[in-house]
């Protein structure tokens, strides 16, 4: 199956403090290789979660992604701040046998506005 | 079928105000992204400003910020761009353009309304 | 900003003949590309988006394509109406939106 990364929000919003998920999903997992969300695009991105194991404080992924056949890469981010505004981007890479993983595909970006807290 | 009719073009001197509409039909106005994009004599297209459908969400272009403002009446279906401190370089055909409700590009749009500033 | 550069400028060809129209970008835009015409007098009109789908209404003698940097729109066989001026626009790196300059396609 060709593969196709979406992520169907166009934008969320959050008030500050609390939580959000961005959804991402996958038409299929080939090529291997991993799947990175980052905000913001070009040399200013910023990496936010990848599907590799290491620890993110305050983003976790909301299905288990070791499991076989998962198509979803959806995260959550907690304890939303005014900082974490921003566009982010589900991407797709495959992994290179010696090189650097090359990015493939991406998803269209959530735009995450993050509002004032209700008093 | 969408009609996005654009009013309040004219002729005006530097540094006046000029507030220009967009009566929207044919949709459910409310639930879509909205967006100013402008076009100057001989030029091509420049994304102006936009906004969310609920209204609270907003951005502008740098070459306008601080001096237009975008707003809507959901229960008008209109939408409007208030524009202060005119300059020469603002002289363009106006157009309110109705995004697609999953990415930001532009289904509909309409004719146009044209600005002149000039002294 | 993502900078969209298309070339030519302008297109002089006759009726029945076959355009190709360049649209480049100053970083990868996946596919999150559209095209748009423009005809004097009249509200510009969505004719592809994802790069390469036709919008509803289309003619299929319009045909978009490419990925990442590099996309193309190809007219098959130009008829009258299609002398006009076209602009991509990415939708990827935003906002700010931003659309190429223009080609304007005229009759030779």
């Known amino acids: 199956k060709e593969l196709k990364v979406t992520q169907p929000e166009k934008s969320v919003s959050v008030a500050a403090g609390d939580s959000t998920v961005l959804n991402c999903t996958l038409t299929s997992l080939l090529p291997v290789g991993p799947i990175k969300w980052y905000r913001g695009v070009g040399q200013s991105r910023l990496l936010i979660y990848s599907f590799t194991g290491e620890h993110f404080p305050r983003v976790t992924n909301v299905s288990d992604a070791t499991k076989r056949n998962n198509m979803d890469f959806s995260i959550r981010i907690s304890n939303v701040t005014p900082e974490d505004a921003g566009t982010y981007y589900c991407v797709k890479f495959q992994k290179g046998p010696s090189e650097p993983d090359t990015e493939i595909q991406s998803g269209g970006g959530t735009e995450v506005y993050v509002l004032a807290k209700p008093s | 079928d969408v009609q996005l009719v654009e009013s309040g073009g004219g002729v005006v001197r530097p540094g006046e105000s000029l507030r220009l509409s967009c009566a929207a039909s044919g949709f459910t106005f409310s639930s879509y992204d909205m967006n100013w994009v402008r076009q100057a004599p001989g030029e091509g297209l420049e994304w102006v400003s936009l906004i969310s459908g609920s209204g609270e969400i907003i951005y502008y272009a740098d070459s306008v910020k601080g001096r237009f403002t975008i707003s809507r009446d959901n229960s008008k279906n209109t939408l409007y761009l208030q524009m202060n401190s005119l300059r020469a370089e603002d002289t363009a055909v106006y157009y309110c353009?109705?995004?697609?409700?999953?990415?930001?590009?532009?289904?509909?749009w309409g004719l146009g309304t044209l600005v002149t500033v000039s002294s | 900003e993502t900078v969209l550069t298309q070339s030519p400028g302008t297109l002089s060809l006759s009726p029945g003949e076959r355009a190709t129209l360049n649209c480049r970008a100053s970083q990868s835009v996946y596919s999150y590309l559209a095209w748009y015409q423009e005809r004097p007098g009249q509200a510009p009109r969505l004719l592809i988006y994802g790069a390469s789908t036709r919008a509803t209404g289309i003619p299929d003698r319009f045909s978009g394509s490419g990925s990442g940097t590099e996309f193309t729109l190809t007219i098959s066989s130009l008829e009258s109406d299609d002398f006009a001026v076209y602009y991509c626009?990415?939708?990827?790196?935003?906002?700010?939106?931003?659309f190429g300059g223009g080609t304007k396609v005229e009759i030779k």
């Open positions: 626009q990415q939708y990827y790196d935003r906002p700010p939106l931003t």
């Open positions: 353009a109705k995004e697609n409700n999953r990415y930001r590009f532009f289904d509909d």
